[in-house]
Interface confidence: low
């Protein structure tokens, strides 16, 4: 899976969209999880309604919400009041039994609030070091990862 970069401004909301084949994933619940390290597990943050027919209802876990347009085939995750610690690698998942299919890998980047007194160009990254192939940028404030570029500079 390629990784898609979504950038948001600290303190504001960020919407992440994960398109999928609505026929292939018909009847399946979805989830948003956070990747723990390069080879680590993906820790569930929030999942859609237990009753698949009610997947359109927004479900919250803390400041993260999820809603699923099962006919159109778009899973939408909202990260409210974005904070530096929200930066990192996530996955949109389609659940079936004990299995989970990855719909999209997402790199969330948090930009400093330009109204803050810090340098408006600051970027927060998670601590792990991980490299990706290409990234398809979908957010209005966004950039592409170059092939081989390391998005998480090692922290000293």
């Amino acid at each position: 899976h390629n990784t898609t970069v979504f950038q948001g401004v600290a303190g504001q909301s960020l919407q992440v969209s994960c398109p999928y084949d609505s026929m292939k994933h018909w009847g399946r619940r979805k989830a948003w999880c956070r990747q723990l390290g390069e080879k680590g597990p993906c820790q569930r943050v929030v999942s859609t309604h237990n009753l698949w027919l009610l997947s359109f209802l927004r479900r919250w876990n803390g400041s993260t919400a999820i809603t699923d347009d099962t006919l159109g085939g778009t899973l939408t995750i909202t990260l409210r009041n974005l904070q530096p610690h929200d930066a990192g690698l996530y996955q949109c998942q389609s659940l079936h039994g004990s299995e989970a299919d990855t719909l999209r890998k997402v790199l969330v980047e948090v930009l400093a609030d330009p109204l803050d007194h810090r340098d408006a160009g600051d970027l927060w990254f998670p601590g792990e070091s991980e490299s990706f192939e290409d990234a398809h940028v979908e957010h209005s404030i966004s950039r592409s990862l170059l092939e081989g570029e390391i998005p998480f500079p090692p922290t000293s």
Epitope: M23, K24, G27, R28, W52, L95, G97
Partner: antibody, heavy 123, light 112 residues
Framework: EVQLLESGGGLVQPGGSLRLSCAAS????????MNWVRQAPGKGLEWIGR????????NYAQKFQGRATISADTSKNTAYLQMNSLRAEDTAVYYC????????????????WGQGTLVTVSS | DVVMTQSPDSLAVSLGERATINCRSS???????????LHWYQQKPGQSPKLLIY???NRFSGVPDRFSGSGSGTDFTLTISSLQAEDVAVYYC?????????FGGGTKVEIK
């Protein structure tokens, strides 16, 4: 009318390989999972794996992982099963079978099966 | 993998009598979406398998109403209420809740 037609069976030498075809018609091939299932003479049914032709997504039973490859050509509405390093115990009738979809949940049941093609592994 | 265990291996029933086949799974077959993907197939001699019952209790199109399915969780039953000569076949239960899909060993139904 949904139809599945397998071909490519026959006599194969031990250590050889096979490539079976499953020609599908009468439904939207690219948006239904296609399975391969086999049945050894006088034995039960054994699931090999499946493919979603729309994007090529595949799953395999662990027993066949690395030895079986399932692919699909949506322009020909055909699914394929390639198996390598064949042994006598791979002698079986091989079936392709489509997954039924029934709203509001996926049924994930195999509603249409091909007639099967016999593969005999022998020297 | 989910292991499917059928019983009995074979069954001889008089015409018009009831036939009951049991199927047990090694783990619950309830999917995360709430559905249970337990199905029954019928295979007559020299033929391909045919879908009989899907999702525990739903008869597939064209299947006579003498066939019924029941059960939940890990224990399931296929019942033929009044056995007919054309019902002589091997019956398989199968789960598709989890990958890999798995089948029971089959139950051969004959006329007594």
């Amino acid at each position: 009318e949904v139809q599945l037609l397998e071909s490519g069976g026959g006599l194969v030498q031990p250590g050889g390989s096979l490539r079976l075809s499953c020609a599908a018609s009468g439904y939207a091939f690219s948006s239904s999972w296609m399975n391969w299932v086999r049945q050894a003479p006088g034995k039960g049914l054994e699931w090999i794996g499946r493919i979603y032709p729309g994007d090529g997504d595949t799953n395999y039973a662990q027993k066949f992982q690395g030895r079986a490859t399932i692919s699909a050509d949506t322009s020909k509405n055909t699914a394929y099963l390639q198996m390598n390093s064949l042994r006598a115990e791979d002698t079986a009738v091989y079936y392709c079978a489509r997954l039924l979809r029934n709203q509001p949940g996926e049924s994930y049941a195999m509603d249409y099966w091909g007639q099967g093609t016999l593969v005999t592994v022998s020297s | 993998d989910v292991v499917m265990t059928q019983s009995p291996d074979s069954l001889a029933v008089s015409l018009g009598e009831r036939a009951t086949i049991n199927c047990r799974s090694s783990q619950s077959l309830v999917h995360s979406n709430g559905y249970t993907y337990l199905h029954w197939y019928q295979q007559k001699p020299g033929q391909s398998p045919k879908l009989l019952i899907y999702k525990v209790s739903n008869r597939f199109s064209g299947v006579p109403d003498r066939f019924s399915g029941s059960g939940s969780g890990t224990d399931f039953t296929l019942t033929i209420s009044s056995l007919q000569a054309e019902d002589v076949a091997v019956y398989y239960c199968s789960q598709s809740t989890r990958v890999p899909y798995t089948f029971g060993g089959g139950t051969k139904v004959e006329i007594k």
